[in-house]
Amino acid sequence: EEELQVIQPDKSVLVAAGETATLRCTATSLIPVGPIQWFRGAGPGRELIYNQKEGHFPRVTTVSDLTKRNNMDFSIRIGNITPADAGTYYCVKFRKGSPDDVEFKSGAGTELSVRAKPSAPVVSGPAARATPQHTVSFTCESHGFSPRDITLKWFKNGNELSDFQTNVDPVGESVSYSIHSTAKVVLTREDVHSQVICEVAHVTLQGDPLRGTANLSETIRVPPTLEVTQQPVRAENQVNVTCQVRKFYPQRLQLTWLENGNVSRTETASTVTENKDGTYNWMSWLLVNVSAHRDDVKLTCQVEHDGQPAVSKSHDLKVSAHPKEQGSNTAAENTGSNERNIY
């Protein structure tokens, strides 16, 4: 009679993560008597996957009933496959012995490859805000995919970016892989509404790539432009001065009026108007009683935006333009946009 052969008909099996893998194995003879065992890997460091004699195998089931006398089908199913299950599986026939069973014949092996989807890409930007014309870096990470081949693209508002570097780790063989990419983006004043998108394409995604996004509103700081103007005289001894704070982002802004270098009023931007590009405008008024001044007045609008060093714009009030010097000793009463004044 011909010597027993262990046949593993499939050289390779490809399974998606979470699914069940069937590893086929048949023997050509019932002799010699002895159990079958399944191993992952070969040599002394192999891992025992299934033992016909004993053991507890929550994820492994046999295809046929191995207790039947004439059974020669030793195929197994492994459930809930993960990338960690990848490897070459050997079906090995043992000959009954004393005290130990002796390895008799091994199958040629079946390579189990696991296709695992990449995790949703996570995009993160710089820790601190940056101003227009500066270049900032964004990172994109995705993990747990297999096989290693993967494509990553960057977009800003739908336009593909070219300035980025991507690494897939580890370099050698692994059960699963991670991708890490860093893109450089030049900010513009119009970027408050802009989005940076990292797009990952993988064989497991069937042409429907995964995307991670970052809003540049979290990254950009657009500093304000200031304009101080003198309004027409409201009363003979009163002048209305406005400070227009334009095109700033984010909203966090504090304004201080100085009269000849002395703090007159400090206020925080509240009722702002939003521009189409996402930046904000704000206006503050200062009502000046010129009759209280003998000399010209230097009015300064000083703005501290988003914790940055203050910027300021000044305006010189010519007192000589107002001949009447009468009324209150109070030099100025500053008012917010609600024009609350005490006159």
Epitope: R40, P44, G45, I49, N51, H56, V60, A84, D85, D100
Partner: nanobody
């Protein structure tokens, strides 16, 4: 060289549960088959449970089947033994063991590395 350190032992009442942990260092944990053994006073060390390197296959001594569960976390280099419905005869020093090769309940012969042990006492 592999270092093994058990923890979680203590004194419990019969019928209670107890969980033992063993942390391994010094070698790639996912290349080691792991096991638990115990030694009661005046008795030989006996096999309790074993688990293959990926955790796919597990082995239990007959008297522990259904009461004890072995598991592992390769990311944390940990192997666990959850013991339920404890009996006074489970009183022993419990040892963690690591093997470079593993053939089911042949594990006692194959174990290359042993921990110092942790005492479990079950009072009636």
């Amino acid at each position: 060289q592999v270092q093994l350190q058990e923890s979680g032992g203590g004194v419990v009442q019969a019928g209670d549960s107890l969980g033992l942990s063993c942390v391994a260092s010094g070698r790639t944990f996912s290349s080691l088959d792991m096991g638990w053994f115990r030694q009661a006073p005046g008795k030989e060390r006996e096999f309790v449970a074993g688990i293959s390197r990926s955790g796919i296959s597990q082995y239990y001594a007959d008297s522990m089947k259904g009461r004890f569960t072995i598991s592992r976390d390769n990311a944390k280099n940990l192997v666990y033994l959850q013991m339920n419905s404890l009996k006074p005869e489970d009183t022993a020093v419990y040892y963690c063991a690591a093997a470079l090769t593993f053939r089911g309940s042949d594990l006692p012969r194959d174990s290359n590395y042993w921990g110092q042990g942790t005492q479990v006492t079950v009072s009636s």
